[in-house]
Interface confidence: medium
């Protein structure tokens, strides 16, 4: 494997070379972590502290902004209830969402009490608005988390916003919510650990199942404890969950509560030496690379280790096939607290627990018409057995030699002369981006990895906690607690002055054109356009 | 017609033991969390403890924690509370009520009570 | 001492309309917890009166009524009857690990 990045550039050689714009926060502000893109727009809207942006894509130092706080009344009841005044008694966002093409939809910790409202942007980008609805705010409960610390994943689609969230002050009663909309609110079950264990959640996508959109499915992505008996002593594990959209949930004891929500874990391991796996189980983010088929798209995960001792990070691949088998496989199940969970062997009732009611795969038309022996079965069977593992069975990268973990993904697929490329941007805890491409060896999947650049992409050592990429503008845009980034996806003119350089780079935004490194454009018609992705051989490409 | 019944209360001097009981019916036992709420006579409620569908979540109100332990057993549509240590001040009515999840989203309300049961604690 | 606050006492005339307050702190009502209310005829078990702070279950007259704002809550009841005559509990939950709390209890007493 090539861990020696090809490029390694520090904040100075970012800034003199023109290569990053950072934004570098307010004095009031904080907490740059929920990002929203938009493209058609050319906007990239930030949630930090007390504040909501909107920034150019083409310069980040173009900026609108939106002040959010909380009144001093409530300010000061966090701080009678023992918060910490700067880093807790404030207005947090941790929800935007596109509401509609003229609204979107904010909701932030309120000072641990979360508080909702909308975001007038406009009709169109030549409107030139970005104003708070000052009129209509709601209850955040269910959307935003009380507590600042506490991850969310949320995705507003058709009038609806599914939020995995703590939906407390303690940050104790975590559940993925369906509110908005015009139907009661949906949530999963309350004080059961077989459900969701103390998760963190990471993200939320719609997939669809099948051409008949009854089929589409919600995935969240977090991880949290390993039930008792699943694991010898205290564990992680990464989960996928799967929701359907039209679940409106169940009758008895499943009235507004989740109906069809299953989950599974997520395997990223090594084989180590003693014959024990090395697992990366702290799930940190995930990216869908949706290609051709919206269907099937490829799930990047990025995953660091839970020990102490050994400090790692990977990156794995999975297939949505390999979760619908997954799915469709055996439940987990256990006769009792003491006993080891085994795959359930009795009769699954009809229509199989998970399966979205459509008249694609089964003649009902409702979750609330489901029999008592389904709502029976799915509220005690909510886990899989079988767990998804990465595609060939392995992680794609791994660091665990470096004073850093991995904490964000983004992935761009570029094509190139020999063939298309996922470009990998992986952000770390120290607030460096690695840029990693992943080369097929034999057969697509099976991967060679190339670390590309290693850029320092802020002043200060600060993680990285969120991250957009712009195919439109071929940038990168990089949020943290002290500030937003912006960078380009490709720096060709650094990799050298000669053609040899530039094709043993290996980057598949970059080509040499005869007299210098540059930009490849796949339907520029340039026979002297020399690269070589699979190989990096410049001998057979560079006649100098 | 959902019923709740308690029984078991009655005289006890302290740091005497009962086991309150309550007998469910007309609705599905199993899928319900439920808990006990009790009142001295002449004051007000107050919550004591509640048991969620599965026995999976179990919490006490900290006058009693440590000394009543709560249990159900869903073959039987019945509820326990197991009483140790009996003080004075744990003379009350004491109420079986199940938690209405359906109605109230977040917190559950108690949508069905039993008549109760009297437990003294005197010497 | 109640977490939650209730005026000891109301009274109104029949046909009156009255109302019961209820007042919590930023760490039960003020944290965004559910509010319910319960009447508790003489003798008899409390019963569900308003759920989710404005929500009625079935068989509850309209004249009750039910709000929310801020750290507080309130139960109003019109066109008082003489059977309206009870002791009404306001509840929800206490952080920090949440639990039920009741308020003290309000004594309605319909004069004449």
């Known amino acids: 494997k090539n861990n020696v990045p090809r490029l390694k550039l520090s904040y100075k050689e970012m800034l003199e070379s023109n290569n990053v714009i950072t934004f570098n926060g307010l004095a009031n502000s904080s907490s740059y972590h929920t990002f929203l893109l938009d493209e058609e727009r050319s906007r990239l809207y930030v949630g930090a502290k007390d504040h909501i942006f909107s920034f150019d894509l083409v310069n980040i130092k173009d900026f609108q902004k939106i002040v959010w706080p909380v009144s001093y009344t409530r300010r000061d009841e966090c701080k009678w209830a023992g918060k910490d005044i700067l880093k807790e008694c404030a207005n947090f966002i941790k929800v935007l969402k596109a509401y509609n093409q003229t609204h979107l939809y904010a909701c932030g910790t309120g000072a641990f009490h979360p508080i909702c409202t909308y975001i007038e942007i406009g009709h169109h980008p030549e409107d030139n608005i970005f104003k708070l609805e000052n009129s209509h705010f709601e209850n955040g409960r269910g959307k935003s988390p009380y507590d600042p610390k506490l991850l969310t994943a949320s995705l507003l689609i058709d009038g609806e916003l599914y939020s995995g969230t703590a939906a407390d002050f303690m940050g104790r009663d975590f559940a993925i919510f369906r509110t908005l909309g015009h139907h009661h609110p949906i949530r999963t079950e309350q004080h059961d650990s077989r459900w969701l264990n103390d998760p963190k959640f990471i993200s939320a996508h719609l997939i669809s199942e099948s051409d008949n959109p009854e089929d589409d499915k919600v995935y969240f992505f977090f991880r949290e404890n390993a039930i008792d008996g699943e694991h010898s002593g205290k564990a992680t594990h990464a989960r996928i969950g799967q929701i359907c959209k039209n679940d409106f949930g169940g009758h008895r004891s499943l009235v507004n509560k989740w109906t069809t929500f299953l989950k599974a874990r997520l395997i990223c391991s090594v084989p180590g030496p003693n014959g024990i796996d090395t697992h990366f189980d702290e799930l940190q983010d995930v990216f869908l690379m949706n290609f051709k088929d919206p269907k099937n798209p490829v799930v990047y995960g990025v995953f660091t280790t839970s020990s102490n001792i050994f400090k790692g990070s990977a990156v794995c691949m999975y297939s949505m096939s390999d979760v619908r088998r997954v799915f469709l496989g055996p439940y987990a199940h256990r006769d009792g607290p003491n006993y080891q969970w085994v795959p359930y062997q009795g009769r699954v009732p009809y229509p199989r627990p998970g399966t979205c009611p459509s008249k694609t795969f089964g003649g009902f038309d409702s979750t609330k018409d489901l029999p008592d022996d389904v709502i029976t079965f799915a509220r005690s069977h909510p886990a899989m057995y079988n767990p998804v593992f990465p595609m060939n069975n392995r992680p794609i990268v791994i660091k665990t030699d470096v004073n850093y973990q991995f904490t964000q993904i983004v992935v761009d697929r570029v094509d190139a002369e020999d063939g298309q490329y996922d470009v990998m941007f992986i952000g770390t805890d120290v607030g460096t981006v690695l840029k990693v491409v992943s080369i097929p060896k034999e057969t697509w999947y099976d991967l060679e990895e190339v670390l590309l650049e290693e850029m320092t992409v802020f002043r200060e050592p600060t993680a990285i906690s969120a991250m957009e990429l712009s195919t439109k503008q071929q940038q990168l845009y990089i949020g943290s607690t002290a500030g937003v980034a912006q960078l380009p996806l490709h720096r060709c003119d650094i990799y050298g002055k000669a053609c040899a350089e530039c094709c043993l780079a290996r980057d598949p935004y970059c080509a040499w054109d005869g007299s210098a490194c540059s930009r490849y454009f796949p339907t520029a018609k340039r026979a002297t356009r020399a690269q070589d992705i699979r190989n990096g051989d410049p001998l057979t490409h560079c006649s100098d | 017609e959902v019923q709740l019944l308690e029984s078991g209360g009655g005289l006890v001097q302290p740091g005497g033991s009962l086991r309150l009981s309550c007998a469910a019916s007309g609705f599905d036992f199993s899928s319900y969390e439920m808990n006990w709420v009790r009142q001295a006579p002449g004051k007000g409620l107050e919550w004591v403890s509640g048991i969620s569908w599965n026995s999976g979540w179990i919490d006490y109100a900290d006058s009693v924690k440590g000394r009543f332990t709560i249990s159900r057993d869903n073959s039987k549509n019945t509820l326990y509370l197991q009483m140790n240590s009996l003080r004075a001040e744990d003379t009350a009515v004491y109420y079986c009520?199940?938690?209405?999840?359906?109605?109230?989203?977040?917190?559950?309300?108690?949508?069905?009570w039993g008549q109760g049961t009297l437990v003294t604690v005197s010497s | 001492q109640s977490v939650l606050t209730q005026p000891p006492s109301v009274s109104g005339a029949p046909g009156q309309r009255v109302t019961i307050s209820c007042t919590g702190s930023s760490s039960n009502i003020g944290a965004g917890y559910d509010v319910h209310w319960y009447q508790q005829l003489p003798g008899t078990a409390p019963k569900l009166l308003i759920y989710?702070?404005?929500n009625r279950p079935s068989g509850v007259p309209d004249r009750f009524s039910g709000s929310k704002s801020g750290t507080s809550a309130s139960l109003a009841i019109t066109g008082l009857q003489a059977e309206d005559e009870a002791d009404y509990y306001c509840?929800?939950?206490?952080?920090?690990?949440?639990?039920?709390?009741f308020g003290g209890g309000t004594k309605l007493t319909v004069l004449g």
């Open positions: 009520a199940r938690s209405g999840y359906s109605s109230s989203w977040f917190d559950p309300d108690f949508d069905y």
């Open positions: 509840s929800s939950y206490e952080g920090p690990n949440p639990y039920v709390v």
């Open positions: 989710g702070a404005s």
